[in-house]
Interface confidence: low
């Protein structure tokens, strides 16, 4: 038998070997595909199957527009002019080349020694599903489940039957200062079909370190406020994108939604204490600000009560 690959939507002509080029012809086409429950014999006279597959005057079989359901086996049995029976056997596979794959949600930079999501490679509209592969500096990246982790997802469109592939790459770069180039390629796995490549992304790898310049600003300055007054604490961080900010009072997290600003209206003595903010940045982990003391007092003459500006309470996860 002969293996044939046909592009979805395009016509396919299968020749019936040995058949005379014009009538009278003794031939029979049989097919077993996704359209048939078992073997279906086609009549040269035509019929309801003509829109799907019909026999041409020269004995060849025409599929005007191949679809996924046309995958299967096609057989022709013909008697040539000398009365000898000749058989043809075809195994038909169809394919569809997807659009060019893309890397969506790419990282802006990577941090050495911690897991970083590089991005998600997406290919839409393939058949068969095919495969996505990641490349680092032009070389194939083999996932090892440790420094290189790939999460794959394949979905099939319920109507068209075409596949969408997603591949999420997470890496732990070993050292900073490098500029690795990542790309992704889609391959159908068919002969003579070249892989489709994404545009490469080049990312800077930096050494792990806390977000620079985390400061806790307090209003009123000095942190001394009269009962019933308002205190505004602002966690000022220069990191981009802005990290999530949680608030700590006397060493315990406050049960509040993350926010860079903490407003304490109508303060009472129960609001007194040491406050700090903790910034959680995806590539660094938490970093705590220097603490600030809040004092509630009738008189404003006790002097500044700011917490000492020491080291951050949290280092980075290297």
């Amino acid at each position: 038998g002969q293996n044939i690959t046909a592009r979805i939507g395009e016509p396919l002509v299968l020749s019936c070997k040995g058949a005379p080029k014009k009538p009278p012809q003794q031939l029979e086409w049989k097919l077993n595909t996704g359209r048939t429950e078992a073997w279906k014999v086609l009549s040269p006279q035509g019929g309801p199957w003509d829109s799907v597959a019909r026999i041409l005057p020269n004995g060849s079989l025409l599929l005007p527009a191949t679809g996924i359901v046309d995958e299967g086996t096609f057989r022709c049995r013909a008697t040539n002019r000398r009365g000898k029976e000749v058989k043809s056997n075809y195994r038909v596979r169809v394919y569809q080349i997807p659009g060019k794959p893309e890397i969506v949600d790419p990282a802006s930079e990577l941090t050495a020694s911690v897991p970083n999501k590089v991005g998600t490679c997406v290919s839409e509209g393939s058949y068969p599903a095919g495969t996505l592969s990641w490349h680092l500096d032009g070389k194939l990246l083999i996932p090892d489940g440790k420094e290189t982790l790939v999460k794959e997802e394949t979905r099939r469109h319920p109507e068209t039957g075409l596949f969408t592939l997603r591949s999420e790459l997470t890496v732990i770069p070993t050292q900073g200062g490098t500029h690795p180039t990542f790309s992704c390629s889609f391959s159908l796995g068919l002969p003579r079909r070249r892989p489709l490549n994404t545009a490469p992304i080049q990312l800077r790898v930096r050494e792990p370190g806390p977000p620079e310049g985390i400061q806790l600003l307090v209003e009123p300055e000095g942190g001394i406020v009269a009962p019933g007054g308002t205190v505004t604490l602002t966690c000022a961080i220069s990191a981009q994108p802005p990290p999530q900010v949680h608030w700590i009072k006397d060493g315990a997290p406050l049960p509040l939604a993350p926010s860079p600003v903490l407003l304490l209206p109508e303060v009472g003595h129960e609001d007194e204490g040491t406050y700090s903010c903790v910034a959680t940045h995806p590539s660094h982990g938490p970093q705590e600000s220097p603490p600030v003391s809040i004092r509630v007092t009738e008189t404003g003459d006790e002097g500044p009560a700011e917490g000492s500006v020491g080291e951050s309470g949290l280092g980075t996860l290297a």
């Epitope: 489940g145 982790l149 999420e168």
Partner: antibody, heavy 117, light 109 residues
Framework: EIQLQQTGPELVKPGASVKISCKAS????????MLWVKQSHGKSLEWIGN????????FYNLKFKGKATLTVDKSSSTAYMQLNSLTSEDSAVYYC??????????WGAGTTVTVSS | QAVVTQESALTTSPGETVTLTCRSS?????????ANWVQEKPDHLFTGLIG???NRSPGVPARFSGSLIGDKAALTITGAQTEDEAIYFC?????????FGGGTKLTVL
């Protein structure tokens, strides 16, 4: 064989400090972070913090900040955890575990710390 | 702080398949939580089984597998054996804070 060997049980008085060690063997000590975990009697596990032996950088659960101090000695492939100002709440089994972020595959046998006067 | 919830106890029979789950109070567990599964045998013997949601630790039998099922992390033991009787803890990373579940006591009868 990869092993994490922890010090034996410790009986300490309230207010005192204790330093637990975790000696690594069978792998490159600086290639993995070391995780420390607390298991109180009849309770679940609590993450204390991590240390990256390569950088010496630490990363603490806020709950244990000030209570635990993590250090390493690269020359002896040993990780240490010092617990300060001990109270009965600190009586527990403390574990070190090797981690590479994806998993914590090898654990020490644990060090039992009992705080009692 | 997030709370991680597990079944307190499960019972299975040798050869059966059993699935332990791990729920997060903050919403769906995702691959970004790098779900870990740790086994505790008597005498405080801990072994890491699964990390990064579905990566088996070196030397762990293939009958142990990790996955996400719905909005939870899951540990499946396919063809449980009597030696699998243990307490299983899951742990989830939250922006580099690690939180353990309460543990599931698995009995293999």
């Amino acid at each position: 064989e990869i092993q994490l060997q922890q010090t034996g049980p410790e009986l300490v008085k309230p207010g005192a400090s204790v330093k637990i060690s975790c000696k690594a063997s069978g792998y490159s000590f600086t290639d993995y972070i070391m995780l420390w975990v607390k298991q109180s009697h009849g309770k679940s596990l609590e993450w204390i913090g991590n240390i990256n032996p390569y950088y010496g950088s630490t990363f603490y659960n806020l709950k244990f900040k000030g209570k635990a101090t993590l250090t390493v000695d690269k020359s002896s492939s040993t990780a240490y955890m010092q617990l300060n100002s001990l109270t009965s709440e600190d009586s527990a089994v403390y574990y070190c575990a090797r981690s590479d972020y994806w998993y914590f595959d090898v654990w020490g046998a644990g060090t039992t710390v009992t705080v009692s006067s | 702080q997030a709370v991680v919830t597990q079944e307190s106890a499960l019972t299975t029979s040798p050869g059966e398949t059993v699935t332990l789950t791990c729920r997060s109070s903050t919403g769906a567990v995702t691959t970004s939580n790098y779900a870990n599964w740790v086994q505790e045998k008597p005498d405080h013997l801990f072994t890491g089984l699964i990390g990064g949601t579905n990566n088996r630790s070196p030397g762990v039998p293939a009958r142990f597998s990790g996955s996400l099922i719905g909005d939870k992390a899951a540990l499946t033991i396919t063809g449980a054996q009597t030696e699998d009787e243990a307490i299983y803890f899951c742990a989830l990373w939250y922006s580099n804070h690690l939180v353990f579940g309460g543990g599931t006591k698995l009995t293999v009868l």
